[in-house]
């Protein structure tokens, strides 16, 4: 996922809508002007803000990387939602890229969890039922995995 925090404009473009801050803050989909007197709308598809705020810039929309699919586009109040392509996943501790799911479990292990956009297949020992934490199986059985469907927002 590639994302810059701030949209590049310093001043509002003429077509951007303005309104007055409410209690000193601006609503989602807007940022505050430099003098604090106006709320300026974010640009649809370019930048956004999700909360009441006093941001001087709206936040730049995420662009989904290759290897990701866009589940929902960026709006003025919500960032793009990206998801790993079928057969790949993104772990919480390494969110920068989608990794290929394993195609099967090592010998002596059985698959108990499918490949999803946020987790690899899950393998456990047939007898003990303990999880296998190894990255790559030494010998794979021909057990194929099916991708999960739920989405996770990218931020």
């Amino acid at each position: 996922i590639t994302q810059q925090d701030l949209a590049p404009q310093q001043r509002a473009a003429p077509q951007q809508k303005r309104s007055s801050p409410s209690e000193g803050l601006c609503p989602p989909g807007h940022h505050i002007s430099e003098d604090g007197r106006d709320c300026i709308s974010c640009k649809y598809g370019q930048d956004y803000s999700t909360h009441w705020n006093d941001l001087l810039f709206c936040l730049r929309c995420t662009r989904c990387d290759s290897g990701e699919v866009e589940l929902s586009p960026c709006t003025t109040t919500r960032n793009t939602v990206c998801q790993c392509e079928e057969g790949t996943f993104r772990e919480e501790d390494s969110p920068e890229m989608c990794r290929k799911c394993r195609t099967g479990c090592p010998r002596g292990m059985v698959k108990v969890g499918d490949c999803t956009p946020w987790s690899d297949i899950e393998c456990v020992h047939k007898e003990s039922g303990t999880k296998h934490s190894g990255e790559v199986p030494a010998v794979e059985e021909t057990v194929t995995s099916s991708p999960g469907t739920p989405a996770s927002p990218c931020s």
Partner: antibody, heavy 119, light 106 residues
Framework: EVMLVESGGGLVQPGGSLRLSCAAS????????MSWVRQAPGKGLEWVAT????????YYPDSVKGRFTISRDNAKNTLYLQMNSLRAEDTAVYYC????????????WGQGTLVTVSS | DIVMTQSPSSLSASVGDRVTITCKAS??????VAWYQQKPGKAPKLLIY???TRHTGVPSRFSGSGSGTDFTLTISSLQPEDFATYYC????????FGQGTKVEIK
């Protein structure tokens, strides 16, 4: 003279709760956006929460979202920070701060109150 | 989050010296930068906002400059009361601070 005086800090166990208060004087409290900022021992400053002048709108960084709640009582000229599910990393001096006129940043700060999260 | 990298982390100087502290933003923040002075056990005090505007009552020996990603706080002639820790802050996207520069007596 603008004055902000924090209170309510102390020692609390991990998982515990604490409510900080900030008494404001010397300015029209109800006209100003207010924030809490913290400073962990020997570390830099970190923004914790912001509330609109009337108290209707709030926002937080991800580090405290869902655990901390900022509120205010304009009749009493007081700002509050309710802190729940406290963690060791929340140990810090907590400052209440006022956002200035037409500058969109903090112009006056209180002296701070120390919160220690430890078992 | 925008990271503000302040340097040096500490410096030793004498009364009358010219002192320069720099702050680098991880991305363009325009001129939305403030500088604060903090003494031990005291509240931070606003010196400069919008990168170069002195706050009410701040002596003219304090000046700020910069835009985009590079910012500077200069104390033209250090006074005894200026020995303190100085912080930069960006306020274009939420609020993030530099790690501070401690100005000590040489």
């Amino acid at each position: 003279e603008v004055m902000l005086v924090e209170s309510g800090g102390g020692l609390v166990q991990p998982g515990g709760s604490l409510r900080l208060s900030c008494a404001a004087s010397g300015f029209t409290f109800s006209s100003y956006v207010m924030s809490w900022v913290r400073q962990a021992p020997g570390k830099g400053l970190e923004w914790v929460a912001t509330i609109s002048s009337g108290g209707s709108y709030t926002y937080y960084p991800d580090s405290v979202k869902g655990r901390f709640t900022i509120s205010r009582d304009n009749a009493k000229n007081t700002l509050y920070l309710q802190m729940n599910s406290l963690r060791a990393e929340d140990t810090a001096v907590y400052y209440c701060a006022r956002r200035g006129d037409s500058m969109i940043t903090t112009d006056y700060w209180g002296q701070g109150t120390l919160v220690t999260v430890s078992s | 989050d925008i990271v503000m990298t302040q340097s040096p982390s500490s410096l030793s100087a004498s009364v009358g010296d010219r002192v320069t502290i720099t702050c680098k933003a991880s991305q363009d923040v325009g001129t939305a930068v403030a500088w604060y002075q903090q003494k031990p056990g005291k509240a931070p005090k606003l010196l400069i906002y919008w990168a170069s505007t002195r706050h009410t009552g701040v002596p003219s020996r304090f000046s700020g400059s910069g835009s985009g990603t590079d910012f500077t706080l200069t104390i033209s002639s250090l006074q005894p009361e200026d020995f303190a820790t100085y912080y930069c802050q960006q306020y274009s996207s939420y609020r993030t601070f530099g790690q501070g520069t401690k100005v000590e007596i040489k």
